[in-house]
Interface confidence: medium
């Protein structure tokens, strides 16, 4: 899967699927609150933390944002920092923890109806003030108000997995998130390691379905580390 090569402005701190630390690609990428270890579809954190350097919010975990560790610090040295809770100071949405957004410099609870308008303002494609070269498309990714009343089908824009129909999860796709199928037995899955590329996927896969976990495919044990294929397998 592709690293989240793209977005620097999109809202990232949204509640993860299944209540874990985003139990699918993008979750275990962060070094900031600790390493994330899979346990079924839940994740536990272990606090032998080392700061993870970053350039964009999307390179950090769901509960983090990318910034200089010290006020007025060298902008060239940025690390993933823990998100800010309700009523804490902020400068942008990504600084606030899941379920909150930045309003007038303070992290506040994201009432969905109000939040939708905020999304329309802030989930602009990362590169964007130039006019799109494409006809008939706004540069701004807007979310249909319908999505809060009907569950999104495969390919529908979403914010979180609860926006998607049964059997689907909300996963990143380029600069936005769409409903994608939860993985079935035998399908290729993404298992994050501490080493290597930490960025969130641009083409994110869902997590493995119930009763399945993401493990090295048996006939790939001998393969080199970089080419090991992980698939969803029965516990």
């Amino acid at each position: 899967t592709l690293n989240s090569v793209l977005n620097s402005n999109a809202i990232k701190n949204l509640p993860p699927p299944l209540g874990g630390a985003a139990g699918h690609p993008g979750s275990a990428v962060s070094a900031a609150p600790g390493i994330l270890y899979p346990g079924g579809n839940k994740y536990q954190t272990i606090d032998n933390y080392q700061p993870y350097p970053c350039a964009e919010d999307e390179e950090c975990g769901t509960d983090e944002y990318c910034a200089s560790p010290t006020r007025g610090g060298d902008a060239g040295v940025q690390i993933c920092l823990a998100c800010r809770k309700r009523r804490k100071r902020c400068m942008r949405h990504a600084m606030c923890c899941p379920g909150n957004y930045c309003k007038n410099g303070i992290c506040v609870s994201s009432d969905q109806n109000h939040f939708r308008g905020e999304i329309e303002e802030t989930i602009t494609e990362s590169f964007g003030n130039d006019h799109s070269t494409l006809d008939g498309y706004s540069r701004r990714t807007t979310l249909s108000s319908k999505m809060y009343h009907t569950k999104g089908q495969e390919g529908s824009v979403c914010l979180r997995s609860s926006d998607c129909a049964s059997g689907l999860c909300c996963a990143r796709h380029f600069w936005s998130k769409i409903c994608k199928p939860v993985l079935k037995e035998g399908q290729v899955c993404t298992k994050h390691r501490r080493k290597g590329s930490h960025g969130l996927e641009i083409f994110q896969r869902c997590y493995c379905g119930e009763g399945l976990s993401c493990r090295i495919q048996k006939d790939h044990h001998q393969a080199s580390n970089s080419s090991r294929l992980h698939t969803c397998q029965r516990h």
Partner: antibody
Framework: EVQLLESGGGLVQPGGSLRLSCAAS????????MSWVRQAPGKGLEWVSI????????YYADSVKGRFTISRDNSKNTLYLQMNSLRAEDTAVYYC??????????????WGQGTLVTVSS | DIQMTQSPSSLSASVGDRVTITCRAS??????LNWYQQKPGKAPKLLIY???NLQRGVPSRFSGSGSGTDFTLTISSLQPEDFATYYC????????FGGGTKVEIK
Amino acid sequence: EVQLLESGGGLVQPGGSLRLSCAASGFTFSKYAMSWVRQAPGKGLEWVSIISGSGGTTYYADSVKGRFTISRDNSKNTLYLQMNSLRAEDTAVYYCARHAHGAGSYPFDYWGQGTLVTVSS
Amino acid sequence: DIQMTQSPSSLSASVGDRVTITCRASQYIGTYLNWYQQKPGKAPKLLIYAASNLQRGVPSRFSGSGSGTDFTLTISSLQPEDFATYYCQQSYSDLTFGGGTKVEIK
């Protein structure tokens, strides 16, 4: 007018290295993700690598992972592809291409003219 | 990885003909599909994006349709400048191209 101009191609021996450049003009370079796409002689198109507008994040096709490195210098409006441990199968015309925003399919809306890389002993 | 299969791999047609090229994905890709035209020695050119949207400056004789796994590029009335190779490309999961369809003069 949007323009992308590749350079740096040439003949190199297997195992050798080469660095391709793509000079961009006519648009705000730092706001666009960019990719390298290649085409072996008489064959189809193959995507190679992508980089975000800020350069903060990159990704590679499995066929080049660990050997190629994409980077960009936004102050120079230039995209790069460092190619190491080159193989005969890397022989191709290499195009740099810009990703359009605005549609979920994020197509390649502008392409350079390409630069030929030949890997041969 | 998602495989993209184009058919036919080549076809012969005359000016004024209606030409249809199909592209099939090995799994669901929604409408995350683009079409390109490439002439010998030249870079590809974007024709259709997101399955059915005509790129600015592309003649209206080109159209795209389909969603899910099956897609079609149609040239309603083939012109001399349309003889080229056409590629589909998906961006639902990674970025992969079809093998191409060469449109030749009959």
